[in-house]
């Protein structure tokens, strides 16, 4: 680093990356106070949270949310039927699989209604703000004497549908080796040290095929190989939190 | 949301330049670290060059003196200027973003360079090419 340094953990949770936000609402009346922004993921297609900050309005304000489908056989908007609270404030809305239709432009309409001219509307490609479960499972097996194979699953989503990144490292490594995996839930070390204890995790996010997802699951549970001797420092070698 | 959207590569001979341009939406560059990694032919993710909001730069050993990261706040740009480029540069290159976190000396000691894993949001990548 030039001045000073700027690393961190890699394995934080998924909202100390950045937090995906909508496109600007559009607001649709006359000068008012504008309302927050809504920010919508769909968690491996099992449901979607749409969230605002509740703490940006000037008083307690149980604000709705609407939503509908451009698209679709009902072009009404349709309310909201599980509400998210914070300190007995409404802040998001969880929207159940049932409802989610990933590739169809998802409208959304946050309001007042003590207001009602106070509402604005956004629209959100649901395809490019899924993401995945942490993949699991992950398995380890001999291919031959020196080489090892690494699979994972992930739950619910097409594995075409993913692209992974497998970071891997030996005892004696003081820094990961990084994969990106295209599609297949598998990778293969072609020479592996049987006297090393080898570490291996993956995170995976929806793209490119099926989504444009640009962010990324958190990492799976590590799964280890080899030699079980005591590492001789290991604080160095620990996993980053 | 948060929108990462590379462009600016190409197929270039060995010793030519590319500047690679990444247009940022849907956050502010206050609190972020902005990075280019790279994926090589043979699949392996390396961070390249990282820039934090106050300017702070990072590069790897390997574009050191060759490419510079830079970015332009007003239009929500991030670059990076490669010269000199040679074919081992030759990958798919993504612009990649986190928030800024305050880190201590001791983890970066823990360390020897940074991760793509660090970084959790991610473009779609730019394929560059450089031929001998």
């Known amino acids: 680093w030039s001045s000073k340094v700027l690393m961190s953990s890699a394995n934080e949770d998924i909202k100390a990356d950045l937090i995906l936000t909508s496109t600007a609402p559009e607001h649709l009346s006359a000068p008012t106070l504008p309302l927050p922004e809504v920010q919508c993921f769909v968690f491996n297609i099992e449901y979607m949270n749409c969230t605002w900050n509740s703490s940006s309005e000037p008083q307690a304000t149980n604000l709705t949310l609407h939503y509908r489908y451009k698209v679709s056989d009902n072009n009404t908007f349709q309310e909201c039927s599980h509400y998210l609270f914070s300190k007995e404030i409404t802040s998001g809305c969880q929207i159940q699989k049932e409802d989610i239709q990933l590739y169809q432009t998802f409208v959304v309409q946050l309001q007042d209604p003590q207001k009602p001219q106070r509402r604005a509307v956004q629209k959100l490609n649901l395809q490019n703000l899924v993401i995945p479960r942490a993949p699991e499972n992950l398995t380890l097996s001999n291919l031959s004497e020196s080489q090892l194979e690494l699979r994972w699953k992930s739950r619910h989503i097409k594995e075409r549908c993913l692209q992974y990144l497998v970071q891997y490292r030996s005892n004696r490594d003081r820094s990961w080796t990084e994969l990106i995996v295209n599609h297949e839930p598998r990778f293969s070390l072609p020479s592996v040290d049987e006297l090393k204890r080898y570490t291996f995790r993956v995170r995976s996010r929806y793209n490119p095929i099926c989504g444009s997802s640009q962010q990324w699951s958190k990492w799976s549970q590590p799964v280890h190989w080899g030699s079980h001797t005591v590492e001789e420092n290991p604080s160095l070698f620990a996993l980053e939190a | 949301q948060v929108q990462l959207q590379e462009s600016g590569g190409g197929s270039v001979q060995a010793g030519a330049s590319l500047r690679l341009s990444c247009s940022v939406s849907g956050f502010t560059f206050d609190e972020s670290v902005m990075s280019w990694l790279r994926q090589g032919p043979g699949n392996e993710c390396d961070a390249v060059a990282i820039?934090?909001?106050?300017?702070?730069?990072y590069y790897d050993d390997s574009v050191k003196g060759r490419f510079t990261i830079s970015e332009d706040n007003a239009k929500n740009m991030v670059y990076l200027q490669m010269n000199s480029l040679k074919p081992e540069d030759t990958a798919v290159y993504y612009c990649?973003?986190?928030?800024?976190?305050?880190?201590?000396?001791?983890?970066?000691?823990?360390?020897?360079?940074?991760?793509?894993?660090?970084?959790?949001?991610w473009g779609q990548g730019t394929q560059v090419t450089v031929s001998s």
């Open positions: 990649a973003a986190r928030r800024r976190r305050p880190v201590y000396d001791s983890d970066y000691e823990l360390r020897p360079r940074p991760l793509c894993g660090d970084f959790g949001v």
């Open positions: 820039i934090s909001s106050d300017d702070n730069t």
